[in-house]
């Protein structure tokens, strides 16, 4: 009983429960393949508990192993469009600091208009995650079609 | 050592480890696009620890942020079938209470016969999740091809 | 404060935070559809904390409910290749002990060159997970395109 009370009194942050779910804000200007994200209760069902946004990119605040997940749906798309513009590719990676730059997760659309995946990966405080969408097709900004999130899993 | 013992004695429910994994029971009658789910050890590898089923739909028992995931495979399907019946779409949303009704996750099959995705979302006690499959194609009831689940992640 | 200190002193293993993320090592010889995995910090961003590898297959060390996830990308592939070689199918299952053999998750490539999915499933100490890729197409060994992992969720 005492333990349960103690647990409730501890701030969640000390338990390492960092988590974020973001919705698409906008795409980058020409020559910038990055997707720019936004999050917060005022925007709907997106949120940031621990991680932060830095110019639309997600910055990690706690070292650990994270589950990273993403879904991106193309807005003006059919299987014909997708194959004609193949390969439209989505890559999630650490883009800063430059010394830790690496691609973590990559998928092509081929003849589909949605990609969705997830993976476990170690991330460190200060890592900024970027999501690059190659090609010219526009992603949907519907919050149930395009989203990106991370969940702290363990140290 | 005392803490470890205390932790083991605490009921899991008090730690907020609500989790469910469901298998497809049946599709709805005409004009009802919902999929109806079932779960429990007698049925195989499906289970409900915390959430409950209400007429085949999943009802949440604990407030928090959840990881929601789903995979649906169409039973009599080829890439030709899928494109000819396009758009066959799967949407997961809160369907009751009506005041909280919202689509959480949506995917189209395009030229594929399986969709799979996951996302983080806040859910509240009493939220009922519905999974709507538009179109006339039949989903597979194989437990390794079609499943739906939630996992409590944090308050 | 005392609780927070006690928590930090507890080995993570006693909290049941078993987790693994693997990268593709090689495919099997003729008549062996299994993918063979490898993991460890020397190999990049893959790791095993709890589970172990047994001849390239993942063996579980702790009973519980796990989130299992996988992504496989085909290396020499286009939507035409994928459909011509259909059905190329990926199945994740318990392959040993034989008494517990079962398919947990199955997807076909249809006209795509990547599959990705995840599910919750109960696993027991000693369960070995195998990933079978039917057909003759070669999977990519790029670590951001093909990976397989598990995360302990609750007892």
């Amino acid at each position: 009983q005492r333990f349960a009370q103690a647990q409730q009194q501890l701030p969640l942050e000390s338990l390492g429960w960092d988590v974020a779910e973001l919705q698409l804000n906008h795409t980058g200007p020409q020559q910038d393949p990055r997707l720019y994200w936004q999050g917060g209760p005022a925007l709907g069902r997106s949120f940031l508990h621990g991680p932060e946004l830095d110019k639309g990119q997600l910055r990690i605040h706690r070292d650990g192993i994270y589950m990273v997940h993403i879904q991106v749906t193309l807005a003006i798309c059919s299987s014909t469009t997708a194959s004609r513009h193949h390969p439209t590719t989505l890559a999630v990676g650490i883009c800063s600091p430059a010394s830790r730059s690496i691609s973590l997760l990559r998928l092509s659309f081929h003849q589909g208009c949605t990609i969705a995946s997830q993976r476990l990966t170690p991330l460190a405080r200060g890592d900024t995650l970027c999501t690059n969408l190659t090609g010219t097709l526009l992603p949907s900004r519907n919050t149930d079609e395009t989203f990106f999130g991370v969940q702290w899993v363990r140290p | 050592q005392r803490f470890a013992q205390a932790q083991q004695q605490l009921p899991l429910e008090s730690l907020g480890w609500d989790v469910a994994e469901l298998q497809l029971n049946h599709t709805g009658p005409q004009q009802d696009p919902r999929l109806y789910w079932q779960g429990g050890p007698a049925l195989g590898r499906s289970f409900l620890h915390g959430p409950e089923l209400d007429k085949g739909q999943l009802r949440i028992h604990r407030d928090g942020i959840y990881m929601v995931h789903i995979q649906v495979t169409l039973a009599i399907c080829s890439s030709t079938t899928a494109s000819r019946h396009h758009p066959t779409t799967l949407a997961v949303g809160i369907c009751s209470p009506a005041s909280r009704s919202i689509s959480l996750l949506r995917l189209s099959f395009h030229q594929g016969c399986t969709i799979a995705s996951q996302r983080l979302t806040p859910l509240a006690r009493g939220d009922t999740l519905c999974t709507n499959l538009t179109g006339t194609l039949l989903p597979s009831r194989n437990t390794d091809e079609t499943f739906f689940g939630v996992q409590w992640v944090r308050p | 404060q005392r609780f927070a200190q006690a928590q930090q002193q507890l080995p993570l293993e006693s909290l049941g935070w078993d987790v693994a993320e693997l990268q593709l090592n090689h495919t099997g010889p003729q008549q062996d559809p299994r993918l063979y995995w490898q993991g460890g910090p020397a190999l990049g961003r893959s790791f095993l904390h709890g589970p172990e590898l047994d001849k390239g297959q993942l063996r579980i060390h702790r009973d519980g409910i796990y989130m299992v996830h996988i992504q496989v990308t085909l290396a020499i592939c286009s939507s035409t290749t994928a459909s011509r070689h259909h059905p190329t199918t990926l199945a994740v299952g318990i392959c040993s002990p034989a008494s517990r053999s079962i398919s947990l998750l199955r997807l076909s490539f249809h006209q795509g060159c990547t599959i990705a999915s995840q599910r919750l499933t109960p696993l027991a100490r000693g369960d070995t997970l195998c990933t079978n890729l039917t057909g003759t197409l070669l999977p990519s060994r790029n670590t951001d395109e093909t990976f397989f992992g598990v995360q302990w969720v609750r007892p």
């Epitope: 439209t88 190659t134 | - | 070669l138």
Partner: antibody, heavy 120, light 107 residues
Framework: EVQLLESGGGLVQPGGSLRLSCAAS????????MSWVRQSPGKCLEWVSA????????QYAESVQGRFTVSRDNSKNTLYLQMNSLRAEDTAVYYC?????????????WGQGTLVTVSS | EIVLTQSPATLSVSPGERATLSCRAS??????LAWYQQKPGQAPRLLIY???SRATGIPDRFSGSGSGTDFTLTISRLEPEDFAVYYC?????????FGCGTKVEIK
């Protein structure tokens, strides 16, 4: 030093068969996918076939599917290409090539090639 | 099926000069493009992969750029041993086609 040495080329009549070999050294042969690539006189390079490191998976260009079979013997560090029902358009220099670790078909090492001539 | 078109077919350059070779894909290949050098009677040699990454042992006068459909191989200062035929190859989809080459000859 990585070395790939092809052999088995020669003159064959249309409809005939030939078996090419490629002896590999200087790397862990069984760890890498391998391909055959051909170059017709005065023409472009053309990918023919690929095989996984273990030998359990193989892929072919449409132009040779059903006629050619790629195989390997990892105990002998040797790659093979069995060519049946040969046609005039199969005339080319055949190279064996080592894939990058990723299994993607770009080739960091090539053999010197062996000439196959299909003519009556 | 993706078609790669190389231009020019022949490029006449003096030693020490810069050479710029082009490869255009019929549809986007992302960055899945490699460049090879082939001298008469020899096998091709990998120069660049991933559009811009130099292969092991390749001098830094060779550089690759581009993504999507337009790619360039640049040789900053031509050495006598650089006169050869250069091929581009797409490897992101099946089949993995090659271009038909650009011959770099001494002016």
């Amino acid at each position: 030093e990585v070395q790939l040495l092809e052999s088995g080329g020669g003159l064959v009549q249309p409809g005939g068969s030939l078996r090419l070999s490629c002896a590999a050294s200087g790397f862990t042969f069984s760890s890498y996918a391998m391909s055959w690539v051909r170059q017709s006189p005065g023409k472009c390079l053309e990918w023919v076939s690929a095989i996984s490191g273990s030998g359990g998976r193989a892929q072919y260009a449409e132009s040779v599917q059903g006629r050619f079979t790629v195989s390997r013997d990892n105990s002998k560090n040797t790659l093979y290409l069995q060519m049946n029902s040969l046609r005039a358009e199969d005339t080319a220099v055949y190279y064996c090539a080592k894939h990058d670790y990723s299994n993607y078909p770009y080739f960091d090492y090539w053999g010197q090639g062996t000439l196959v001539t299909v003519s009556s | 099926e993706i078609v790669l078109t190389q231009s020019p077919a022949t490029l006449s350059v003096s030693p020490g000069e810069r050479a710029t070779l082009s490869c255009r894909a019929s549809q986007s290949v992302s960055s899945n493009l490699a460049w090879y050098q082939q001298k008469p009677g020899q096998a091709p040699r990998l120069l660049i992969y991933g559009s811009s990454s130099r292969a092991t042992g390749i001098p830094d006068r060779f550089s690759g750029s581009g993504s999507g459909t337009d790619f360039t191989l640049t040789i900053s200062r031509l050495e006598p041993e650089d006169f050869a035929v250069y091929y581009c190859q797409q490897y992101g989809s099946s089949p993995p086609p090659f271009g038909c080459g650009t011959k770099v000859e001494i002016k």
